[in-house]
């Protein structure tokens, strides 16, 4: 669980991180996904990229560089406001779309220099470039000119991928993998845990048969399922104990002030 900020050391450049978990080492966890994430490096005092396996790990893990900096670098938000007023687009906003490698099928956003708008694309989870944002808002904030009005989000197909047989270009298939729907999943306000614990079991895309466990948010228990070896989602654990340890903590009965990341 994350802790309240210690405001005794909130000056920029202070060596003490805002939260104790910011001092933890990057932990990729035991699973096989390859999700680009960020952690605060105590030794360089910077937020740095690492590849997260998709399950377990620790709280020193952030989906975006911005989120990492805001959480772990004392006084960062004050300096960020100053920088934003300069309104200059970073170079990476002009990089071409790069879906990367692997089979994460993650919904991401990039800045399209032709249309001057932030658009949706599908990211595989490995490699890729920095023109890759978790949210449309973040993309707009960093790369879109503030004078532009909100724009429609365009789907981008994954024709850049070489797959084992068929190229994934069917949008509905991609969307099914990215946002699996399940009537049994409780509303988000009932569960404050890791978002992938809400996803249904997904056996993936390959031919293997590996025994795995997934968290069933309706029953609050971890159940066995067969995993085919690639693809799928992050609700996928090698043992029941790991599954429970990662997902059980998010139930609403948790009375801590902190938010489970």
């Amino acid at each position: 669980l994350s802790e309240e900020a210690d405001d005794t050391d909130s000056e920029l450049g202070s060596m003490k991180p805002l939260h104790t978990f910011c001092a933890m080492k990057a932990d990729d966890g035991p699973c096989k996904a390859m999700i680009r994430s960020y952690f605060f490096n105590m030794y360089t005092h910077q937020c740095e990229e690492f590849i997260y396996g998709g399950c377990e790990g620790n709280e020193n893990r952030f989906d975006t560089l911005e989120e990492c900096k805001k959480t772990c670098i004392p006084g960062y938000e004050k300096t960020a406001v100053k920088a934003a007023s300069g309104a200059e687009r970073p170079d990476f906003c002009f990089l071409e779309e790069d879906p990367g490698l692997c089979r994460g099928y993650m919904k991401r956003y990039l800045y399209n220099n032709q249309t001057k708008q932030c658009e949706r694309f599908v990211y595989g989870g490995c490699l890729g470039n920095r023109n890759n944002f978790e949210t449309l808002d973040e993309c707009k904030k960093i790369c879109e000119n503030p004078v532009h009005s909100p724009s429609p989000v365009n789907e981008v197909q994954m024709s850049d991928y070489v797959t084992d047989g068929n190229t994934v270009t069917d949008r509905s298939t991609v969307n099914n993998i990215v946002v699996p729907q399940s009537p049994k999943v409780p509303r988000r306000r009932d569960y404050r845990g890791r978002p992938w614990c809400l996803q249904p079991a997904d056996s993936g895309l390959c031919k293997a048969s590996e025994r795995r466990f997934y968290y069933n948010s309706a029953t609050g228990k971890c159940h066995r399922f067969n995993y085919t070896g690639c693809g799928g989602n992050n609700n996928n654990f090698t043992t029941r104990r790991r599954c429970l340890r990662s997902c059980k903590t998010g139930l609403i009965k948790n009375k801590s002030k902190g938010v489970v990341k």
Partner: antibody, heavy 117, light 108 residues
């Protein structure tokens, strides 16, 4: 027939430069592409990788700052510009197509680069 | 960074089963791919994603990945299987990593 053909290898002096090319035929080379090398009598060593659009490039520590990977999709060709060459860069250089699942599914026949005075 | 370790050589009689290991930290959490390389030729992918065989690769080639070791198994080994075999994986720190290679000798 899907194939990759490397060219541009040869003998070069230490400190010299060489540019390797890899022409793809039988398919549109719009996916990630990579260079892998093999020193005489040794194992395989990954050198560099580039994304389909060319916007992302990654290098092994041993070549970072000296080698540059690039591509020309209109020519269906991958390149490796090698500068400040050293004796330890002597190897057969293979170009390969990178599959989404992070393996190399199509390889060229290789081109020999010899760095010697 | 991951380091993949293979035995330098493995010998097998024709018709017998050859097993080539590839070990490394947390290897079950990574996908492992295998390549065959004959003298003077480019490598050829024989197994990808731990245990998937590309089309054109004989059924006698199979793979597994558990414990701290990934294994390439060639059942009913034939003389033409004599070659060097390399395992490979993708790692966040060093990207594409190869094992040192194993020379498979088919006796007789």
């Amino acid at each position: 027939q899907v194939q990759l053909v490397e060219s541009g290898g040869g003998l070069v002096q230490p400190g010299g430069s060489l540019r390797l090319s890899c022409a793809a035929s039988g398919f549109t080379f719009s996916s990630y592409g990579s260079w892998v090398r093999q020193a005489p009598g040794k194992g395989l060593e990954w050198v560099s990788v580039i994304s389909g659009s060319g916007s992302s490039t990654y290098y092994a520590d041993s070549v970072k700052g000296r080698f540059t990977i690039s591509r020309d999709n209109s020519k269906n060709t991958l390149y490796l510009q090698m500068n400040s060459l050293r004796a330890e860069d002597t190897a057969v250089y293979y170009c390969a197509r990178v599959n989404i699942s992070t393996h190399f599914d199509v390889w060229g026949q290789g081109t020999l680069v010899t760095v010697s005075s | 960074d991951i380091e993949l370790t293979q035995p330098p050589s493995v010998s097998v009689a024709p018709g017998q089963t050859a097993r080539i290991s590839c070990s490394g930290d947390n290897i079950p959490e990574k996908y492992v791919h295998w390549y065959q390389q004959k003298p003077g030729q480019a490598p050829v992918l024989v197994i990808h994603g731990d245990n998937n065989r590309p089309s054109g690769i004989p059924e006698r080639f199979s793979g597994s990945n558990s414990g701290n070791t990934a294994t390439l198994t060639i059942s009913g080994t034939q003389a033409e299987d004599e070659a060097d075999y390399y395992c490979q994986s993708f790692d966040a720190g060093s990207y594409f990593v190869f094992g040192g290679g194993t020379k498979l000798t088919v006796l007789g």
